[in-house]
C-alpha cells in the first residue's frame, strides 16, 4: 500500500487532513498529548479504518472502545474506505486519559479522496485501476513481473513529414496515438476540493528529454491532445474538476535505452495543499508509474520472412529475377530500391537492420540505420520508415567509422539456452578485432553501447577483422531445422572444401575446372588448387580464424558440434593479409524460411553437377531446406559481397514477449 503523510493531532484545535484512498496514513497522537495522560482511545466514522499496533512485538488491533497505553511504541495508522462527499465528512476522535484528570478530546476531520495514476502495469494491453494493486513504482522482469511499457514513437504516420512522430509536439491522429501508452488519472473528491489543492504531473529533469506526455481533452466533437510534459516541460499543473473524474494521458518515449539511459521513466502525480496563500504549497501525496522503454529487438533467420529488400543496379536483372522467384516461393513482399535511389550502392544488408519494438498494445517494425552512409544513405529514412514503421540510428553520421560498422557485421542467433541461462530472443553477434592495434577495426562504440543497452539479446563479440570486408556474414549463417535446437549454425569451412576437392581428385577428377562457364575469368583445375602451397597456407590461417569463432559460438550460444554444419569454402589473403572468398561465398546466403538463396559457387562440374552445390544440398536438404543457387558472380562476388550482402529481410516478430524474460 502506498505511503501517505503523517498527521499530528492536538487537543487545542481540530485538525483537518486529506487521506488518499489506498494509502496508509500515520497518526501522531503522542507528541501533542496532554502531559498527565497515560492512555488513549480512538473512535472513528464508519469510512475510516484505524489500526493500532503496540510493539515491539507489534500486536495489531482494529479500534473498538479499548484504551491503549500512551507511549512511543504505539503506532496508529489510518486508511479510508470511501471517498468523501464533502470536505471533512469523516471524523476521528482521540480521547486521552489520565489518573487525575477528566478525558481530553482531540478531533481530526478527514477528507477521503481517490487519486490514482493508472497504466498498463500488468502488461495486458489494457489500463486497469490500480488501487490496492502491486506497487507501480517498481518495474520487474519475467512472467510474474510488473510495470508499464513505452514505445519510442519513431515511425512517421504523417507521410508529408520528413521527421519521426516523436520529433514533434503534436498528435497527428488516432494512428499516432496508438503508438503511445495510455495513462489515466482517476480522481474522486468533494466538489470544492481543488479550491485548496492542486495536482501536478511531473518527470525527473534527467528523464524529461526521454519522454513526452500528451493530455487528451475531450471536446463535444472530437478528442484533442496537447503536450503537458516533455523535453521543455518537466512539470505541469493539472486543471481537475471536483467530483469523480478521469483524465487520459498518452505517453511516448523519445529515446531508446542506451549507455546514458537505462530505459526507465517515472511519471509522478503530486497532490499539493495550496490552502495557505502565505506559505509554499505542501506535498500531501504522490503516486508514480514507472515505464520501461521497449528495446529494439533483432530477428534471426529462423523467424518467418515477411518482406525482402534488394537493389536494382546495372546488369543485375538476372539476380533480381532469382530473388523475386525466391520471395514468391516464401510468400514474401519484395521491395526493390531503384538505381536512381541507390546511387550504385547495392549493399542492402550493410545499410540497415530491421528489427521491431513491442508493447502489450502494439508491435512496430523498426529499421536500424547504419552509419555507413553510402549511396543507400537515404533509403531507410525515405523508403522504409513510414506509418507503423519506425527508425533509429546511432554512431557518427560523418566519418569516423570502419567497414565493421556496416550491418553485414550484425547478426542475431536464434533462441538459445547457455548453461541454464535462457536467451529466448537469441543473442546479437557482431565482429571485432581480436585485440586492439593501430590499424585494427572495431564496430563503433556508440553502436556497441546501443546494442548492449537493449538488454534482451546480450551481444557476443566475434572475430572478423581478419576478413577484407570484415563482416560476420562472410563466415556464418543460421538456418531453421526441424530437430535439436530448431536451427543449425552454418560455418564457412576451408577444411571441408579441401576434403571435397581431394576426394574428387582421388576419383580421377583433378582436371575438373573451377569457374567453368564464367567469361573473362581464369579457370582453375582442382589439381592446381590442391597443389598451390600459398593458397593452402592462406586457408590454414582462415581456418584458424573461423575455428576461434566456432569455439566462441559453441561457448556463448551453448552449441554442440552436431548443431554446426560446415559449408565448403576457400578464401585467399589479399592486401594487408585480409581474407576474401576465393569463389562465391556460399555461407553468405539469403534465408527465407525453408527457401535458401545461395551464391552459385561455379565449382568443378563432375558428372554434370557442380560438386560444391551437390555437397551443400546433401548437407541442407535433409533439414527440409530447398537450395536455390543464384549467380551473383560479376554483380556481387567480384565487388566483395554476395547474396546476403545484397539483400535484406523484415521478419515476423517473436511470439515470446520480451518483458517475460529475465536478462
Amino acid at each position: 500500500m502506498a505511503q501517505g503523510t503523517l498527521i499530528r493531532v492536538t487537543p487545542e484545535q481540530p485538525t483537518h487532513a486529506v487521506c488518499v484512498l489506498g494509502t496508509l496514513t500515520q497518526l501522531d497522537i503522542c507528541s501533542s498529548a496532554p502531559e498527565d495522560c497515560t492512555s488513549f482511545s480512538i473512535n472513528a466514522s464508519p469510512g475510516v479504518v484505524v489500526d493500532i499496533a503496540h510493539g515491539p512485538p507489534a500486536k495489531k488491533k482494529s479500534t473498538g472502545s479499548s484504551t491503549w497505553p500512551l507511549d512511543p511504541g504505539v503506532e496508529v495508522t489510518l486508511t479510508m474506505k470511501v471517498a468523501s462527499g464533502s470536505t471533512g465528512d469523516q471524523k476521528v476522535q482521540i480521547s486521552y486519559y489520565g489518573p487525575k484528570t477528566p478525558p481530553v478530546k482531540a478531533l481530526l476531520y478527514l477528507t477521503g479522496v481517490e487519486i490514482s495514476l493508472c497504466a498498463d502495469i500488468t502488461r495486458t494491453g489494457k489500463v486497469k485501476p490500480t488501487r490496492a494493486v502491486k506497487d507501480q513504482r517498481t518495474w520487474t522482469w519475467g512472467p510474474c513481473g510488473q510495470g508499464a511499457i513505452l514505445l519510442v514513437n519513431c515511425d512517421r504516420d504523417n507521410l508529408e513529414s520528413s521527421a519521426m512522430d516523436c520529433e514533434d509536439d503534436e498528435v497527428l491522429d488516432s494512428e499516432d496515438l496508438q503508438d503511445m501508452s495510455l495513462m489515466t488519472l482517476s480522481t474522486k473528491t468533494p466538489k470544492d476540493f481543488f479550491t485548496n489543492h492542486t495536482l501536478v504531473l511531473h518527470v525527473a529533469r534527467s528523464e524529461m528529454d526521454k519522454v513526452r506526455v500528451f493530455q487528451a481533452t475531450r471536446g463535444k466533437l472530437s478528442s484533442k491532445c496537447s503536450v503537458v510534459l516533455g523535453p521543455k516541460w518537466p512539470s505541469h499543473y493539472l486543471m481537475v474538476p471536483g467530483g469523480k473524474h478521469n483524465m487520459d494521458f498518452y505517453v511516448e518515449a523519445l529515446a531508446f535505452p542506451d549507455t546514458d539511459f537505462p530505459g526507465l521513466i517515472t511519471l509522478t502525480i503530486s497532490l499539493l495543499d495550496t490552502s495557505n496563500l502565505e506559505l509554499p504549497e505542501a506535498v500531501v501525496f504522490q503516486d508514480s508509474v514507472v515505464f520501461r522503454v521497449a528495446p529494439w529487438i533483432m530477428t534471426p533467420n529462423t523467424q518467418p520472412p515477411q518482406e525482402v529488400y534488394a537493389c536494382s543496379i546495372f546488369e543485375n536483372e538476372d539476380f533480381l529475377k532469382s530473388v523475386t522467384t525466391l520471395a514468391m516461393k516464401a510468400k514474401c513482399k519484395l521491395t526493390i530500391c531503384p538505381e536512381e535511389e541507390n546511387m550504385d550502392d547495392q549493399w542492402m544488408q550493410d545499410e540497415m537492420e530491421i528489427g521491431y519494438i513491442q508493447a502489450p498494445h502494439k508491435t512496430l517494425p523498426v529499421v536500424f540505420d547504419s552509419p555507413r552512409n553510402r549511396g543507400l544513405k537515404e533509403f531507410p529514412i525515405k523508403r522504409v520508415m513510414g506509418p507503423d514503421f519506425g527508425y533509429v540510428t546511432r554512431g557518427p553520421q560523418t566519418g569516423g567509422i570502419s567497414g565493421l560498422d556496416s550491418f553485414g557485421n550484425l547478426e542475431v542467433s536464434p533462441p538459445v539456452t547457455v548453461r541454464g541461462k535462457e536467451y529466448p530472443l537469441g543473442r546479437i553477434l557482431f565482429g571485432d578485432s581480436c585485440y586492439p592495434s593501430n590499424d585494427s577495426r572495431q564496430m563503433h562504440q556508440a553502436l556497441q553501447d546501443f546494442l548492449s543497452a537493449q538488454q534482451v539479446q546480450a551481444p557476443v563479440k566475434l572475430y572478423s577483422d581478419w576478413l577484407s570486408v570484415g563482416h560476420v556474414d562472410e563466415f556464418l549463417s543460421f538456418v531453421p531445422a526441424p530437430d535439436r535446437k530448431g536451427f543449425r549454425l552454418l560455418l564457412a569451412s576451408p577444411r571441408s572444401c579441401y576434403k571435397l576437392f581431394q576426394e574428387q581428385q582421388n576419383e580421377g577428377h583433378g582436371e575438373a575446372l573451377l569457374f567453368e562457364g564464367i567469361k573473362k575469368k581464369k579457370q582453375q583445375k582442382i589439381k592446381n588448387i590442391l597443389s598451390n602451397k600459398t593458397l593452402r597456407e592462406h586457408n590454414s590461417f582462415v581456418e584458424r580464424c573461423i575455428d576461434w569463432n566456432r569455439e566462441l559460438l559453441k561457448r556463448e550460444l551453448g552449441l554442440a558440434e552436431s548443431d554446426i554444419i560446415d559449408i565448403p569454402q576457400l578464401f585467399k589473403l589479399k592486401e594487408f593479409s585480409k581474407a576474401e572468398a576465393f569463389f562465391p561465398n556460399m555461407v553468405n546466403m539469403l534465408v527465407l524460411g525453408k527457401h535458401l538463396g545461395i551464391p552459385k559457387p561455379f565449382g568443378p562440374v563432375i558428372n554434370g553437377r557442380c560438386c560444391l552445390e551437390e555437397k551443400v544440398c546433401s548437407l541442407l536438404e535433409p533439414l527440409g531446406l530447398q537450395c536455390t543457387f543464384i549467380n551473383d558472380f560479376f554483380t556481387y562476388h567480384i565487388r566483395h559481397g554476395e547474396v546476403h550482402c545484397g539483400t535484406n529481410v523484415r521478419r515476423k516478430p517473436f511470439s515470446f514477449k520480451w518483458w517475460n524474460m529475465v536478462p
Epitope: 570502419s402 577495426r441 592446381n528 593458397l535 585467399k572 589479399k574 592486401e575 585480409k578 567480384i638
Partner: antibody, heavy 128, light 111 residues
C-alpha cells in the same frame, strides 16, 4: 586506364585542416586500391595512407595516424584525405596513386602495395 | 631517416649498366616479395617501373630489371640512356606499424 587529379592543397596555419580530393576519370575508381604518398620539398617519397577498393579497411603511416583520414565516395569516383591538426612537417606535394585490383590469380599478387597510376600532385604548405 | 636504405647517388655512362641497392630488414624486404621501384624525373610524378621484385609493367623497357637477395632488393638498368637520368625509389610492404615503406631515393646521373 584511369587518370587521377588531386585538388584541395594550399596554405594553411599549423593546427589547421585541409581536405584533399583525388578525382578519377577514364575508369571506375571502385575497382582500384588508392594510396596517398607525399614528398616534402627536396626530399624523398613517404607513403601516407591506403584504402582498399571495397572501402572496408584503411591504413596509415605512423606519422599521420589519428590526424589524417582517408575515405572514398565511389559514386563520385573520388577519394579524399582529410588532414587535421596539420604541422609544419606535413608540408609536401601530396600524390594520389592507384592500382587495379587483380581478381584472376589463385593468390593475390599484392597490388595494394605498389602504385601504377599517379596524379600530378597538389602542394600543401603548413606555415604561420 | 628512411626505413629502407638506398645509396644517395649512382652514375654511369650511356650504354653501361648500373645497379641500385635497397636494404631493408627481415620484416619488410626480407619477408615479402612486394618490392617495387619508381622512377621520378624532376618536377614530375613518380612512375612505376618494377613491381613484385622483378615484374615490369607494360611499356617499361626490358633494360630495367629487379631482383632480391635476403633483405636487399636491387634495380639494374642496363644499356643506360640519357633519359634514364632521374631519381629512383624502392618501396616494400612491411609488417611494421607503417605498412608501406619507401627508400630515401637514389639520384642516377648519366655521364
Amino acid at each position: 586506364q584511369v587518370q587521377l587529379v588531386e585538388s584541395g592543397g594550399g596554405l594553411v596555419k599549423p593546427g589547421g585542416s585541409l581536405r584533399l580530393s583525388c578525382a578519377a576519370s577514364g575508369s571506375t575508381l571502385s575497382d582500384y586500391f588508392v594510396s596517398w604518398i607525399r614528398q616534402a620539398p627536396g626530399k624523398g617519397l613517404e607513403w601516407v595512407s591506403f584504402v582498399n577498393s571495397a572501402d572496408t579497411f584503411t591504413y596509415y603511416a605512423d606519422s599521420v595516424r589519428g590526424r589524417f583520414t582517408i575515405s572514398r565516395d565511389n559514386a563520385k569516383n573520388t577519394v579524399y584525405l582529410q588532414m587535421n591538426s596539420l604541422r609544419a612537417e606535413d608540408t609536401a606535394v601530396y600524390y594520389c596513386s592507384s592500382a587495379t585490383e587483380e581478381v584472376d590469380d589463385i593468390v593475390a599478387p599484392g597490388r595494394g602495395y605498389y602504385m601504377d597510376v599517379w596524379g600530378r600532385g597538389t602542394l600543401v604548405t603548413v606555415s604561420s | 631517416q628512411s626505413a629502407l636504405t638506398q645509396p644517395r647517388s649512382v652514375s654511369g655512362s650511356p650504354g653501361q649498366s648500373v645497379t641500385i641497392s635497397c636494404t631493408g630488414t627481415r620484416g619488410d624486404v626480407g619477408r615479402y616479395n612486394h618490392v617495387s621501384w619508381y622512377q621520378q624525373h624532376p618536377g614530375k610524378a613518380p612512375k612505376l617501373i618494377i613491381y613484385n621484385v622483378y615484374e615490369r609493367p607494360s611499356g617499361v623497357p626490358d633494360r630495367f630489371s629487379g631482383s632480391k637477395s635476403g633483405n636487399t632488393a636491387s634495380l639494374t638498368i642496363s644499356g643506360l640512356q640519357a633519359e634514364d637520368e632521374a631519381d629512383y625509389y624502392c618501396s616494400s610492404h612491411s609488417r611494421s606499424s607503417t605498412p608501406v615503406l619507401f627508400g630515401g631515393g637514389t639520384k642516377l646521373t648519366v655521364l
